[in-house]
Interface confidence: medium
């Protein structure tokens, strides 16, 4: 989109960025607003109701002034002009300040994460080298699902100290591969907490926990709820004994009956002796009948 180069009409040269400019035609804005003036007074643009097409002209002026990408002093004050930027524009930026990131996320607040925002976040995080606690705090405040949008490789750059910023709802959409990466970090982050406090913090990460950690939790009277149990890795649940599951769930063990057709409960039941299941008094069916020999095929494969 090119605006014809025309001379600025007499008396219309902009001395400052102010409300009078909303009455300028697009060609007048192009001709009468100095790009350097615009760059130094970017904070005013947000307070002036420029139209969609007028904003195109202002962006064009900034693009001409900064062909290599805008400086952070301009980026921080872009306001809703940010919505005009393409991912290609944003890739030219070097955003280092968390305040700048917050200012731009604020503009997009309440909307889905746009390609522009995704690019901005990517540039910011790569510039910092890791996803530190303050950044994670900010990102999850604006986008609760942000953490689960990262690949396991990207999550590996999250330092354990950042895990303190994670809220349970931030993990709602994480898949097992992501939790596999996050769980060891959470375990490390919360290691100095006592039993009940530790469980409250680690609970939402348990979808990445191995069998031995679940066995250890079963010794601590944690009373895990069924929703958490259903998110555990099937391979981590299968080796647990009936007694261990009973201790792990505490009073919530009764909920197993309602979930007996769903994984991981279904698969776990198939691995237990029916005698042992009967001790729960829940009427769980599908266990190994009495007198049958249980072969641990996984152990056999490992030996051969």
């Amino acid at each position: 989109r090119e605006v014809e180069k025309t001379a600025c009409p007499s008396g219309k040269k902009a001395r400052e960025i102010d409300e009078s400019l909303i009455f300028y035609k697009k060609w007048e804005l192009e001709a009468c607003v100095d790009a350097a003036l615009l760059a130094t007074q970017m904070d005013r643009v947000n307070a002036i109701p420029f139209t969609y097409e007028q904003l195109d002209v202002l962006k064009h002026k900034l693009d001409e002034l900064y062909p290599q990408g805008y400086p952070e002093s301009v980026i921080q004050h872009l306001g809703y002009l940010f919505l005009k930027m393409s991912p290609e524009d944003i890739r030219k930026w070097n955003v280092t300040s968390l305040e700048t990131l917050k200012a731009l996320l604020e503009v997009n607040k309440g909307h889905e994460m746009s390609p522009q925002v995704a690019t901005l976040i990517d540039r910011f995080v790569k510039g910092r080298g890791q996803l530190d606690k303050d950044t994670l705090d900010t990102l999850t405040a604006f986008y609760p699902g942000y953490l689960c949008s990262l690949s396991p490789e990207e999550l590996s750059s999250v330092p354990p100290s950042s895990i303190w910023a994670v809220r349970p709802q931030d993990l709602d959409t994480c898949d097992p591969r992501q939790l596999d990466v996050l769980y060891p970090k959470a375990r490390l982050a919360f290691q100095n907490m006592n039993g009940s406090e530790y469980f409250v913090k680690i609970q939402s990460f348990l979808g990445g926990a191995p069998t031995e950690d679940l066995k250890a939790l079963s010794q601590q009277n944690v009373s895990m709820d069924l929703a958490t149990f259903m998110k555990l890795r099937t391979d981590a649940v299968l080796p647990l004994t009936v007694a261990e599951v009973q201790k792990l769930l505490g009073p919530h063990v009764e909920g197993l009956k309602a979930e007996e057709r769903h994984r991981p409960v279904r698969d776990w039941i198939l691995r237990q002796r029916q005698d042992d299941l009967d001790t729960l008094g829940l009427g769980l069916q599908g266990g190994i009948p009495n007198g049958y020999l249980v072969l641990d095929l996984s152990m056999q494969e490992a030996l051969s």
């Epitope: 909303i22 009455f23 035609k25 697009k26 947000n46 109701p49 139209t51 969609y52 097409e53 809703y80």
Partner: nanobody, 119 residues
Framework: DVQLVDSGGGLVQAGGSLRLSCAAS????????MAWFRQAPGKEREIVAV????????YYAESVKGRFTISGDNPKNTVYLQMNSLKPEDTAVYYC????????????WGQGTQVTVSS
């Protein structure tokens, strides 16, 4: 295209209040700026207030600053003009308007609603 339907005008005593509404329809309403203009008998049409949907920024003519408030309800695609402390000189036909370009080109207009302020 954008269609605008304005309403809420009427007869009011000086010092009274009115609220005008403008319902906008069309595929890309959110990319338009909305405004209220007015035209008194024998006078030119003048801009009263402007709002930018996206940024929420506003503009007011000097004559109405502090008395009139323009606001938008994005989900409803409706713009309001709350008019307080009305004066006889506010008497005019008020028009809702929308543009993506500038207020001097490519502007869509509502049908107008009469506001009469009696002394």
């Amino acid at each position: 295209d954008v269609q605008l339907v304005d309403s809420g005008g009427g007869l009011v005593q000086a010092g009274g209040s009115l609220r005008l509404s403008c319902a906008a329809s069309g595929r890309t309403v959110s990319t338009y700026n909305m405004a209220w203009f007015r035209q008194a008998p024998g006078k030119e049409r003048e801009i009263v207030a402007v709002i930018n949907w996206t940024g929420g920024s506003t503009y007011y003519a000097e004559s109405v600053k502090g008395r009139f408030t323009i606001s938008g309800d994005n989900p409803k695609n409706t713009v309001y003009l709350q008019m307080n402390s009305l004066k006889p000189e506010d008497t005019a036909v008020y028009y809702c308007a929308a543009t993506r370009a500038s207020w001097t080109e490519n502007t869509y207009w509502g049908q107008g609603t009469q506001v009469t302020v009696s002394s």
